[in-house]
């Protein structure tokens, strides 16, 4: 029996059976809050096998082993995850072991097992033999290995029945608990499952099977369920679904889930029975079941009540993300803010059109309209009185309204208003009545010559690069000198430069008036001689990674003919050099056989260039005695924690201790002290376990039903 | 997979109180689907009484509506019918059903219920 | 409420011929978002109703071919191109699109 869409049992006990019957959870099982103590032998449900999504533990008294509860749960395939986790056992006050010994695949996502004080046999356990990456596990603020004194079944009486594998350079014995071994397959069957009697499975099968090489005789489906068959594709006129088996059309057309309610019902796309459309995809009609490709970002109309929309904070932005069609008017009147013009783009940067007029005032913050990113189409079904659909008034900073080279906008019915915008030339505006088609619209006092431009640098003449030199972390480059028509006139030069992956970036992105800018700003004080061309050093860039770069003359304020002279470049593109590139990551090795090691990495999280090559480098070490010293199967000599009277924990060593060496001294001292990255990596960690533990406590504390 | 089972009793007085319950197995009612109460009296043709949908509001059928009251136990994953005021009018066979986003698809097995002194 | 009225009542077949059952609304069953949620139901004897068509033609996976759906509006019609013995028993229509949800009073399919 199926059982889903995601089972949440918490507060009582007994509501663990509703488990009864099920094979397989489609979806996740939750099993938490339960605070009372309870005794949990009487709670068996050997029927399951599979749950499609994840499990979560949490703060369940009197629970000490999982095991008998779930004595046959043989796969987690982790279609969906708990903060990336497909396991978490968490705060779990009583569990001693895990005890899931016919756990045999996670399928994706890691494993999360913290905070169980008396939690034992997780050393035991070898999780690459269930997972797939062990690299994002993070097992943490569980008993101390030293004091559960984990033995495997046997190894007290010297006959030991679990098998070995090696697990960070040590080779021990696998188990689940002391009496139930850690199940492997022998190596024929390569990557396929196999029964308890260790023969092969059939390859669909994932897990274990109750015959060998039957496709109908699988614990789970390497793939998909199908009519009791394990697929390695779903057949003609079915569709793949939760990411595990085949639903016919009509199922998928009936689906009515809590997620879906609000949407038009699932769709089939690509051979799957979806919620929704995937990115970059629309439906083929409002109540199709079938989606076609969206041209240009998927359309989103939204809709203001009130038809007049204020954008006046992040907040109100917010309720604009993902619109591409905005029924309304925008009213922009953003007076302050952190970080605003990229906070905007985020929310508001897919409108493409809007149905009513667009108004611009007391927008202090603005220094540019750019974050209106993909704005193309202004309607003016609605407009201001005096017929405005564009209107631009007391925008203390402004300074660029979009990049014209990059923009079309039309607008398509209504006239432009712009007044005391002091930083925005009027160039700007009439470059921006020839793009729009509103040229010939406006009335002579509608954009208005004196105040608007009146503190802005208008004529601009352009800056010169002549040369630059890279390397793997500088850039050298220097310019044309500037000569204005008064020498004195020139105070300095001020150099932008920021990464930019790719050659679109223009020199308002990310700015806003409240001091928030995505560029790099070095002040360049002019070479005193005045045969030298002004230029830069530019240090501390990274390798092989490409910047923009441009100047700006620093003036003072010239009035010519009501306007400002200035003098900037044009954007340069310019990458560093390649360089060494940093270790590679979570580097691995296990031995699958007497003359192979298997030897996994994944790339540096810095490349710094084009990676073409590994070189891998081992060598033969001798074996380490201390290993066969003592007899570690027999309880009495694993060290136990013993108290001493004092306040000092004293821990039993079998041998001399090793000291640290620090420094140029050989001889015991004090552990060195730890390295800026160390405490760096330490804070890193504190904080992502509060977020962790955040994102647990905000997903599973809800309000009580009805 | 999903299965439904009506309970409860088989024979009510007049002026009492009809209460049914509906266990479901195979899938939480919290998690979607609307969860329905259909009669057929003896004979007849069936009639949609109501739903309780998986976030727990109620449609009701109006001619009904001042008798009816369905609810749900989501630690059990049951929800109920009570019928007030019966009369032998509502002597039938009980079905709870499953109603997704187009059609019912599953049915219990249905329950008798006689209206009689 | 919106009356769903079928007919005929009765219908004696002979195994092998045609059949047609119609259904009439007391008023347009198109839902606000476009839809026609009718949908044909059979109930054999001592069984609960399953269904064999939902929204006015979609026939129910697994459901015979010789059932077919049609109709638009307020007039739908069930066809069985040839009827089979295990055929018999009482199909209702039944429309979704308005609350209160409404089932015709039901046609008997029997052999003759």
């Known amino acids: 029996e199926i059982c889903g869409p995601g089972i949440d049992i918490r507060n009582d006990y007994q509501q663990l059976k509703r488990l009864e019957n099920c094979t397989v959870i489609e979806g996740y099982l939750h099993i938490l809050l339960i605070s009372k103590a309870e005794d949990y032998r009487s709670y068996r449900f050997p029927k399951l096998t599979v749950i499609t999504e994840y499990l979560l533990l949490f703060r369940v008294a009197g629970l000490e082993s999982l095991g008998d509860l779930f004595p046959n749960l043989t796969v987690i395939r982790g279609w969906k995850l708990f903060y990336n986790y497909a396991l978490v056992i968490f705060e779990m006050t009583n569990l001693k072991d895990i005890g899931l010994y016919n756990l045999r695949n996670i399928t994706r996502g890691a494993i999360r097992i913290e905070k169980n004080a008396d939690l034992c046999y997780l050393s035991t356990v070898d999780w690459s033999l269930i997972l797939d990456a062990v690299s994002n596990n993070y097992i943490v603020g569980n008993k101390p290995p030293k004091e559960c004194g984990d033995l495997c079944p046997g190894t007290m009486e010297e006959k030991p029945m679990c098998e070995k594998t090696t697990i960070n350079n040590e080779y021990n014995y696998r188990c689940w608990t002391t009496n139930r071994c850690q199940k492997m397959c022998p190596s024929t069957c390569g990557k396929r499952a196999c029964t308890e009697n260790n023969e092969c499975c059939h390859p669909e099968c994932l897990g274990s099977c109750s015959a060998p090489d039957n496709d109908t005789a699988c614990v789970a489906c390497r793939h998909y369920y199908y009519a009791g068959v394990c697929v390695p594709a779903c057949p003609p006129n079915t569709y793949r679904f939760e990411g595990w088996r085949c639903v016919d059309r009509d199922f998928c057309a009936n689906i009515l889930s809590a997620e879906s309610s609000d949407s038009e019902g699932f769709v089939i796309h690509d051979g799957e029975c979806m919620q929704e459309c995937p990115s970059g995809f629309i439906r083929n009609g409002s109540q199709s079941m079938y989606c076609i490709p969206c041209e240009g970002p998927c359309p989103k109309v939204c809709e203001e009540e009130k038809k007049t929309k204020t954008i006046d904070s992040v907040t109100s932005a917010q309720m604009l993300q993902g619109c591409t069609i905005f029924k309304g008017n925008l009213l922009i009147n953003i007076r302050r803010g952190n970080n605003i013009a990229s906070e905007l783009e985020n929310f508001m940067g897919l409108i493409e059109v809007v149905t009513g007029y667009v108004k611009i005032r007391h927008s202090h913050a603005l220094v540019s309209l750019s974050f209106l990113k993909n704005l193309r189409l202004i309607l003016g079904e609605e407009q201001l009185e005096g017929n405005y659909s564009f209107y631009v008034l007391d925008n203390q900073n402004l300074q660029q309204l979009w990049d014209w080279d990059h923009r079309n906008l039309t607008i398509k019915a209504g006239k432009m208003y712009f007044a005391f915008n002091p930083k925005l030339c009027v160039s700007e505006i009439y470059r921006m009545e020839e793009v729009t088609g509103t040229k010939g619209r406006q009335s002579k006092g509608d954009i208005n010559t004196r105040n608007n431009g009146e503190r802005a640098s208008c004529e601009s003449d352009v800056l010169h690069f002549t040369s630059t030199t890279t390397s793997k972390n500088r850039i050298i480059i220097t310019w044309h000198r500037y000569r204005p028509p008064d020498y004195r006139d020139l105070i300095s030069f001020t150099v932008y430069y920021k990464e930019a992956p790719f050659k679109n970036v223009t020199e308002y992105d990310g700015q806003d008036a409240c001091g928030s800018n995505s560029w790099n700003m070095v002040d360049v004080d002019l070479p005193p001689n005045k045969d030298v061309e002004p230029g830069i050093l530019l240090h501390g860039l990274k390798p092989w990674t490409q910047y923009a770069v441009y100047v700006k003359a620093v003036t003072l304020t010239m009035v010519e003919n009501d306007h400002i002279r200035g003098a900037k470049s044009e954007i340069l593109y310019i990458r560093t050099n390649a360089s060494v590139p940093s270790i590679p990551l979570d580097v691995l090795s296990a031995s699958n056989s007497s003359s192979q090691l298997i030897v996994k990495w994944n790339p540096p999280s810095l490349p710094n260039g084009n990676l073409s090559y590994y070189i891998v480098r081992w060598q033969r070490q001798p074996q380490d005695g201390y290993l066969y010293r003592h007899n570690y199967c027999s309880k009495d000599k694993i060290p136990i924690r013993k108290y001493a009277d004092g306040t000092i924990d004293i821990e039993e060593v079998t041998e001399n201790p090793k000291t640290e060496v620090c420094g140029g001294e050989k001889g015991p001292c004090c552990a060195c002290p730890k390295t800026e990255a160390e405490k760096q990596a330490e804070k890193e960690e504190a904080e992502y376990r509060k977020v962790f533990e955040n994102f647990l406590h905000n997903s599973i504390f809800v309000p009580r039903p009805e | 997979q999903v299965q439904l089972q009506e309970s409860g009793p088989g024979l009510v007085k007049p002026s009492e109180t009809l209460s049914l319950t509906c266990t479901v197995s195979g899938y939480s009612i919290t998690g979607g689907y609307l969860w329905n109460w259909i009669r057929q009296p003896p004979g007849k043709g069936l009639e949609w009484m109501g739903y309780i949908s998986y976030d727990g509001t109620n449609n009701y059928k109006p001619s009904l509506k001042d008798r009816i009251t369905i609810s749900r136990d989501t630690s059990k994953n049951q929800f109920s019918l009570k019928l007030s005021s019966v009369t032998a009018a509502d002597t039938a066979v009980y079905y709870c059903?499953?109603?997704?986003?187009?059609?019912?698809?599953?049915w219990g097995q249905g329950t008798l219920v006689t209206v009689s002194s | 409420d919106i009356v769903m009225t079928q007919s005929p009542l009765s219908l004696p077949v002979t195994p092998g011929e045609p059949a047609s059952i119609s259904c009439r609304s007391s008023?347009?069953?198109?839902?606000?978002?476009?839809?026609?949620?009718l949908q044909w139901y059979l109930q054999k004897p001592g069984q609960s109703p399953q269904l064999l068509i939902y929204k006015v033609s979609n026939r129910l996976y697994g459901v015979p071919d010789r059932f077919s759906g049609s109709g638009s509006g307020t007039d739908f019609t069930l066809k069985i191109s040839r009827v089979e013995a295990e055929d018999v028993g009482v199909y209702y229509c039944?429309?979704?699109?308005?609350?209160?949800?409404?089932f015709g009073q039901g046609t008997k399919v029997e052999i003759k």
């Open positions: 008023q347009s069953i198109v839902h606000s978002n476009g839809n026609t949620y």
């Open positions: 039944f429309q979704g699109s308005h609350v209160p949800w409404t």
């Open positions: 059903a499953r109603y997704g986003r187009v059609f019912f698809d599953y």
